[in-house]
């Protein structure tokens, strides 16, 4: 089982949509898949997939879940809010018919405020 | 390109243990998401998958060879082994050894083949 | 473990003719999650390796020549030349990855008349 997770880094407005894609590709086929998303190690969702579809649609504060065969799984985010800036990573294992499991690399969330005001602030803020 | 050669003894005694090596050039096996896999070919037959080794290290045997077959990696020499215990005359083939993706589920690059009999 | 039946077992064939082989699997080899049939055919040309013309049931791997087509769904598949030429010649196997054990079919040997 091996997971692709993209993009590695986006940035998108407060009030905007963002889009995580999860590629997850097995040489063998699957009867059950359980899938999950964490944001900053924290669990959003953790649904899983058979017969082609999802068991839950929804993940976390405004984040919804779609899987479109052969192999994406998507969490999209609309609208983005200033909470979502975060570590996003997407795991994956088949339970059935044997457990297997993987997991993608960290997509770095950053939400930029809708006041230009605040992203000078915020800016600013940064250190060094 | 991506290149597999097996090599090892092409003849074996009976009960004695067959070893064979694989060693894969433009390409790493330690690349996530690959099997390392072996087939058999036995005179004038069908092919019969023996086993793979994915990324990881875990291990996947066909049911009618496991108790024999012991397949590995030597990540710093950049090959796959294959040992097969206790062969009988029957165990004489062509054995090959090939790669297969999680992206794909089929076998895209194959050695030459290597024959090896069985005889005492 | 999945059986997979192939006929006929030996293929003579014109050239400039069409050829059919066909591939039955024990159990179906479509998956609903994926939406995809774990079938490949692979052609063995004498004293060579197997080298794989289709996957997923009906995609040509590049490089392979147009007249080379897969079909079929299910437990039920077919490879087609549709005008085979001399370099054809060979063992063409039909080949499960939707469970391990891994399993081929014993082979089709096309022949030229």
């Known amino acids: 089982l091996s997971v692709q997770q993209g993009p590695n880094l986006l940035q998108v407005r407060q009030g905007s949509q963002a889009t995580l894609v999860c590629q997850v590709d097995q040489a063998t086929a699957w009867e059950r898949l359980r899938v999950k998303w964490t944001k900053d190690g924290a669990i959003l969702c953790q649904p899983y997939i058979t017969n082609g579809s999802l068991s839950l649609g929804v993940c976390g504060p405004q984040g919804r879940l779609s899987w479109q065969a052969p192999s994406h799984l998507t969490l999209q985010l609309d609208p983005v809010s200033l909470n979502h800036s975060g570590a996003y990573v997407c795991w994956a294992a088949v339970e059935i018919p044997e457990l297997e499991e993987a997991e993608g690399n960290i997509t770095r969330l950053f939400v930029d405020p809708d006041d230009p005001t605040q992203n000078r602030n915020r800016i600013a803020s940064f250190p060094g | 390109q991506v290149q597999l050669q097996e090599s090892g003894p092409g003849l074996v005694k009976p009960s004695q243990t067959l070893s064979l090596t694989c060693t894969v050039s433009g390409f790493s096996i330690t690349t996530g998401g690959y099997y390392w896999s072996w087939i058999r070919q036995h005179p004038g037959k069908g092919l019969e998958w023996i086993g793979y080794i994915y990324t990881s290290g875990r291990t996947y045997y066909n049911p009618s060879l496991k108790s024999r077959v012991t397949i590995s990696v030597d990540t710093s020499k950049n090959q796959f082994s294959l040992k097969l215990s206790s062969v009988t005359a029957a165990d004489t083939a062509v054995y090959y050894c090939?790669?297969?993706?999680?992206?794909?589920?089929?076998?895209?690059?194959w050695g030459q083949g290597t024959l090896v009999t069985v005889s005492s | 473990d999945i059986v997979m039946t192939q006929t006929p077992s030996s293929l003579p064939v014109t050239p400039g003719e069409p050829a059919s082989i066909s591939c039955l699997s024990s159990?179906?080899?479509?998956?609903?999650?994926?939406?995809?049939?774990?079938l490949n055919w692979y052609l063995q040309k004498p004293g060579q390796s197997p080298k794989l013309l289709i996957y997923?049931?009906?995609t040509r791997l590049s490089g392979v020549p147009d007249r080379f087509s897969g079909s079929g769904s299910g437990t039920d598949f077919t490879l087609k030349i549709s005008r085979v030429e001399a370099e054809d010649v060979g063992d063409y196997f039909c080949?499960?990855?939707?469970?391990?054990?891994?399993?081929f079919g014993d082979g089709t040997r096309l022949e030229i008349k």
């Open positions: 080949q499960q990855h939707y469970e391990t054990p891994l399993t």
């Open positions: 159990q179906s080899l479509f998956s609903s999650n994926t939406k995809r049939n774990y």
């Open positions: 090939a790669d297969m993706a999680d992206k794909g589920g089929w076998f895209a690059y």
């Open positions: 997923h049931a009906s």
